[in-house]
Every structure is written in C-alpha cells, then in structure tokens.
C-alpha cells in the first residue's frame, strides 16, 4: 500500500519540517519561520505557538515541533500543554475569585497552587494528634490514646474536618 501511495502521491515523500508545495509542482518546501509540521506528507505547516504575556518560552518552535510554553514566575501552568497560567498563592492560602485567601481553620495547603484541604482526622484511624496542624501543614497523627503509657498526655485533637473546597468568599 505504501509503495502505491508514494507513486500516486508525491506529497507522501515530504518529511516532517516541510510541506507539499502545490505552487511549486508539489515539491517539498521547508516550513517557513514561525511554522512547523510534526509529521510527513503535510500540505500546509501549522503556525507556531507564541509564548507571550504571562507565558514564557520553554522551548522554541522548530520546523518539526511546536513551541513549548510555561508560566512566568508567580504563576503556574494549568491544562494540557500549559494552556493557561494561574496566579500562585503562598503556602497556607488558596486562590479564590477575590484573590489569595488564607486557609480556614482546620484546613491547610502546603503548595503555591490548589485548594485548602482538611486536616487529617486522626481519630478516624484510632490515633491521636501528635503535632497540631497549621494553615501550611497537616496534623501529624501519633499512636492511639490507648497505646500511650500511663500519665502521658496527647495534644488536643483538631476541630472536625470540613469538606474540601474553597473557603468562604
């Protein structure tokens, strides 16, 4: 099949990085600057992605592959191929419609992105709280109260965990 196809269609011989130029008797012409073709046999080249504004260039566009973008400092990528940039927040915060807000009590976020999540409820696993949680860190669970030697005291357990989600606006 391939042999038949190449005899009938001269464009099938054009490698990646070129296009089959109908204006020049279907010879293979290099993709012009700011365009690319990632597969052979193409009749047009695709326009290169421009990493502008909040996007920055990770890798230039070549004749055979599109440019790769990421986000400028203070932002992070969202979506396939970094289709969007979202503002970073500090640890202990989450991004809301009104900007970065501190995590509510009983929740934490140890990253610059994402939402505040509830502290682990140690008692659900029959354990006690060894280290209290903060806005930036989850609680650390320790042995169950029954495992503690007589006279040993545990840290007061946290308030009941809330469902994950954005803090009230």
């Amino acid at each position: 099949f391939e042999r038949t196809r190449s005899l009938q269609d001269p464009c099938s011989n054009c490698p990646a990085g070129t296009f089959c130029d109908n204006n020049r008797n279907q010879i293979c012409s290099p993709c012009p600057p700011n365009s690319f073709s990632s597969a052979g046999g193409q009749r047009t080249c695709d326009i290169c992605r421009q990493c502008k504004g909040v996007f920055r260039t990770r890798k230039e566009c070549s004749s055979t592959s599109n440019a790769e973008c990421d986000c400028t400092p203070g932002f992070h990528c969202l979506g396939a191929g970094c289709s969007m940039c979202e503002q970073d927040c500090k640890q202990g915060q989450e991004l809301t419609k009104k900007g970065c807000k501190d995590c509510c009590f009983g929740t934490f976020n140890d990253q610059k992105r994402g939402i505040c999540r509830p502290w682990t409820n140690c008692s659900l696993d029959g354990k006690s709280v060894l280290v209290n949680g903060t806005k930036e860190r989850d609680v650390v669970c320790g042995p169950s109260p029954a495992d503690l030697s007589p006279g040993a005291s545990s840290v007061t357990p946290p308030a009941p965990a809330r469902e994950p989600g954005h803090s009230p606006q």
């Epitope: 070129t18 290099p30 600057p33 260039t57 230039e60 070549s62 004749s63």
Partner: antibody, heavy 113, light 112 residues
C-alpha cells in the same frame, strides 16, 4: 553586541566572559555563545532563551554556565584547559530562534601554563 | 550527537560561476538548518536559516534548499566578495535540555 573578559589564564582557572548589548532587549531574544579555536571551525556552546531557560551542548554541560541581566549575558567557564583556547562569540538569535543572527566581534581566551 | 558533514572542504571557481556546497546530517533535522559566511578575522554572518529563508540584507544570489538529511547552499554569479569559509549548522534538541546545534566542518571558497 560586544564580548569582553577574554585574557590569558592558567589551566584550571575559572573565567567569566560578558556580552554587552545595546539597541535591543536581551530578555526578548535567544542569546547564544559560540567559540572558535585558532584556525578551526565553529563550536556551539549554548544559549539562554527569552523564557530565561538555558540549553547547552553535551560537551559544554556542567563546565559552562550562561546567565543574564537586563543588558548583559555572562558565560562562566570552569576547569579550563588548553583545548578551551578560542575566540568566544556572543550572538543574538534570529526570529525567535537559536540560530545566531547578530554576532559580536569575539573575545580571545588563551589557556596556557 | 548529530554530525554535520560538509562537502567539499574547498572549492575553487572563477568569478560569475555558480558554487554548490552540500551539508549532510547524520539524522533527520527537518528544515532546521542555517548557513553562515565567515571571512578571516571577522565573526560569521548568517546567510540562510530554516533551510531556505534568506537572512535580512543577504543578496538573492545566495539560496538554500533541502530537508531531512540533505541540504544545499548555492551561490550564483560568484563575486570576489564571496571568497570566505561557509558553515552549515543544525538545530536539534535532545533530552534533558541538551542541544545538538552542530556546525559542519566548513567549506572554503577561493577564486581561480
């Protein structure tokens, strides 16, 4: 585009070359370093792109470091040997690429004991 | 690594002749190839990039063609000012942010 910092150094001495530009913004272009040993061909070292990412050829990775400010691009070189004796060129990439388009006159680095 | 093999190493032609220089890549590089001209004591000058795109200010006597692994620089209507060494160079990205932007060995153009 103009390079500076080239001089005679002894083997093992670190050296930093500086590329100073005027008339355009460094942060909008690929800025490239290429070298040429006396009487020899051209060798691509690496570049810093408009996104502040650095890329190096295999032989240069680890021993050469490219960085930039708003008006200069530096090439830091370590563990220099006689084989690093060359004219070092700084160039601006053409059309958003890492093809060297606008070249400086070069600066000579001689490594000898 | 991507090895760029340039031929011939030297070419001698009279004024107004046509010179053809070839560059072969050890693996397919699409159309990611440039040509440079260098005269003694001067930095190289970009002539052509993306295999066939003429750089700004370069006379149309210079032309580039090819794709994949085989590329050609053609200088027509040769002038005295064209006496120089010509280099090809590819753009190729490897893994781990390593690049193989290799230059060919050069072709010296002299006059008969």
């Amino acid at each position: 585009v103009e390079e500076s910092g080239g001089r005679l150094v002894t083997p093992g001495t670190p050296l930093t070359l500086t590329c100073t530009v005027s008339g355009f913004t460094i942060s909008s272009h690929h800025m490239i370093w290429v070298r040429q040993a006396p009487g020899e061909g051209l060798q691509y070292i690496g570049f810093i792109n408009d996104g502040d990412y650095t890329y190096y050829t295999n032989w240069a990775k680890g021993r050469f470091t490219i960085s930039r400010t708003s008006t200069t691009v530096d090439l830091k070189m370590t563990s220099l040997t006689a084989a690093d004796t060359a004219t070092y060129f700084c160039a601006r990439g053409v059309d958003g690429t890492s093809y060297p388009g606008l070249w400086g006159p070069g600066t000579l680095v001689t490594v000898s004991s | 690594d991507v090895v760029m093999t340039q031929t011939p190493a030297s070419v001698s032609e009279p004024v107004r002749a046509t010179v053809t220089i070839k560059c072969q890549a050890s693996q397919s590089i699409g159309a990611d190839l440039a040509w440079y001209q260098q005269k003694p004591g001067q930095p190289p000058k970009l002539l052509i990039y993306r295999a066939s795109t003429l750089a700004s200010g370069v006379p149309s006597r210079f032309s580039g063609s090819g794709s994949g692994t085989e590329f050609t620089l053609t200088i027509s209507d040769l002038e005295c000012a064209d006496a120089a060494t010509y280099y090809c160079q590819c753009i190729y990205y490897g893994t781990d942010d390593v690049i193989y932007h290799t230059f060919g060995g050069g072709t010296e153009v002299v006059f008969k």
